[in-house]
Interface confidence: low
């Protein structure tokens, strides 16, 4: 008769580091002591006729245990295979590129340390929750890769790595481990340089707008812009509208920047840079300044009029040009009554890179002269009818402007000047029309001949 040695449990599965209670039993009536052969740490817990119970502790790896007993001088054996399962100790997705150009491939790499049994361990690479790759874990550590074509939609997307230990056939379920996610940043930077709109000329101490625009940029909000006039960085206001980035700044030229300069616009995204440069000439244009040696001159005095401007500026005073750019234009005159109120015009021209810039200035001369009455506007003999309305059309001139009064000789009777009045016979007579100012008096005699009103 053939006797058996049973080992229970048969082919157990347990988690790494766990303990196992093993029972060996036989139906042989004359069996000796049952022995357990294993490399694992074991302890005999109990035994009796035809059986023995052992405790196996700290089971870390797959193992085969063997029970043996002598029955009637012959050895009989029984065995059981222990399968140990363990979750991975480390699941890590390798760092992604800091910026990934859209339309180019990049590689996802996942490393898995530990985890058993390897035959039941699968590594999955994910974008959001979408599976990009599913591969078995082979070596230790297992390294799984996938090549992905970067798209705009990938910007900001989380990528992760997941391990699946499938112990469902053993009735233990599916054990999942996931790495920390890594976020991808994708970008598009066109090969074309930015469009830079800047003035060709900029006057010292003046401000002008500078606009720098780049289309087809993604994500525009992440781009860095550097705008500068020479080595002077400009404070730019950056705006994004869709895939267009616009930087606007105010360029103000300093005196020490005079001459040929460059306006530079750099747009940096994803570690790449696009640059535009425009030439600009910073110029200073002082004047023109028109001066009178005497703003208020006396009749007959000599007045000098001069016009000056900055270096390289050609001035022309009342049509007379200065000898050379940067020099003063001058003219002299003997002040006469006709020069009172005269304006002297000075135009200044500066050539900047082949373009001519023009500015004008003027000054007005005042000439002080004594009072005069214009005989042409003041008839010396007037024949008027009684009881009619007339105007004494006399005008005085002078600087300061004189007061004009017409008084009847031998009386203090005054007739209005320049405004209508009713004439009667009492107005008959000779009048002293006197223009007076702080610069003297001028008298003109006017005779009024009033013809009496006839009732016929």
């Amino acid at each position: 008769q053939e006797f058996l040695l049973r080992v229970e449990p048969q082919n157990p599965v347990l988690s790494a580091g766990g303990s196992l209670f093993v029972n060996c039993s036989t139906d042989c009536p004359s069996s000796e002591k049952i022995a357990l052969e294993t490399s694992l740490s074991k302890e005999l817990v109990a035994s009796g006729m035809g059986w023995a119970a052992f405790n196996l502790s700290n089971v870390t790896g797959n193992s085969r245990i063997l029970c043996s007993v002598y029955c009637n001088g012959s050895q009989i054996t029984g065995s059981s295979n222990i399968t140990v399962y363990g979750l991975p100790e480390r699941v890590e997705l390798a760092p992604l590129p800091p910026w990934q150009p859209v339309g180019q491939n990049f590689t996802l790499r996942c490393q898995v340390e530990g985890g058993s049994p390897r035959t039941s361990l699968t590594v999955v690479l994910l974008r959001w929750e979408e599976e990009l790759s599913r591969q078995p874990a082979v070596e230790e550590p297992a390294e799984v890769t996938a090549t992905v074509l970067a798209s705009r939609d990938d910007h900001g997307a989380p990528f992760s790595c997941r391990t699946e230990l499938d112990m469902q056939p053993q009735g233990l379920g599916l054990f999942v481990n996931t790495s920390a996610p890594r976020q991808l940043r994708t970008f598009v930077l066109p090969v074309t340089p930015p469009r830079l709109v800047a003035p060709r000329f900029l006057e010292v101490e003046t401000s002008w707008p500078v606009d720098c625009t780049l289309d087809g940029l993604f994500p525009a909000s992440e781009a860095q812009v550097y705008l500068a006039l020479g080595d002077q960085m400009l404070n730019a206001t950056v705006m994004n509208h869709g895939d267009t980035l616009t930087a606007t700044a105010t360029a103000t030229a300093r005196a020490d920047q005079e001459g040929a300069r460059e306006i530079v616009c750099n747009v940096t995204l994803g570690g790449e840079r696009r640059e535009a440069r425009e030439n600009l000439t910073v110029f200073s244009f002082l004047g023109p300044i028109v001066n009178l040696s005497e703003p208020t001159a006396h009749e007959g005095s000599t007045v000098t009029v001069s016009c000056m401007a900055g270096a390289r500026v050609q001035v022309t005073l009342d049509g007379v040009p200065a000898a050379a750019p940067g020099q003063t234009a001058q003219l002299q005159l003997n002040a006469t009554e006709s020069d009172d109120g005269r304006s002297f015009f000075c135009s200044a021209t500066l050539e900047v890179d082949g373009e001519f810039l023009h500015r004008n200035s003027s000054v007005q001369l005042r000439v002080l002269y004594g009072p005069k009455i214009d005989r042409a506007t003041c008839p010396q003999h007037l024949k008027w009818k009684d009881k009619t309305r007339h105007v004494l059309q006399c005008q005085a001139r002078g600087n300061p402007y004189p007061e004009l009064r017409c008084l009847k000789e031998g009386s203090s009777r005054e007739v209005p000047v320049g405004i209508p009045f009713f004439v009667n016979v009492t107005h008959n007579g000779t009048y002293q029309c006197q223009a007076s100012s702080s610069r003297g008096k001028y008298t003109l005699v006017v005779v009024m001949d009033i013809e009496a009103f006839s009732s016929h």
Epitope: V197, P199, S207, P209, N235, A249, T252
Partner: antibody, heavy 119, light 112 residues
Amino acid sequence: EVQLQQSGPELVKPGASVKISCKASGYSFTDCIILWVKQSHGKGLEWIGKINPYFGTTTYNLKFKGKATLTVDKSSSTAHMQLNSLTSEDSAVYYCARKEAYPDAMDYWGQGTSVTVSS
Amino acid sequence: DAVMTQTPLSLPVSLGDQASISCRSSQSLVHSNGDTYLHWYLQKPGQSPQLLIYKVSNRFSGVPDRFSGSGSGTDFTLKLSRVEAEDLGVYFCSQSTHVPYTFGGGTKLEIK
């Protein structure tokens, strides 16, 4: 006296283009910036863009880029705005205005040009 | 873009009353040069807008002293000390610190 005189009202068909003008007088045309503003019932006042007559440089509101093109004719002291591919959304009153310093207020405005887009 | 929000939408007043209009910006209007480019315009019925106040508080030439502007950063106010019939119309605030320049939706000043 500063004046900005705009061209008369326009009735245009969808898909067409229109060019409106703004003639400046009473000041040196190249000394000030010309700006354009749209006024429609639904959206109030909207800034379209600006042009520097001296240099001919332009700055657009990105919303109107491709829709509006700003130009100047220095010889006649006139600013122009061309509106392309017109739709009913472009029906509005368009104003030109000027400003002196950068960036400063629009101190004088044209009387406005009414553009009606209708088939 | 700098969004300009005006309140109230409509402001019914009696002639001689005081009136106040508020304008708030979604971002600071202080320019890099230190100036604040916030302006007020009035559009009378059937007319173009006209400038009243520039750079927060400066009255444009010919604007009566009953108009005054104040504020800083993002909050601004236009005040009329005594409303007259010629003041009726729609008031707009506007900024030219940031491109694109933007306008408030307008406040209609009307007789009660």
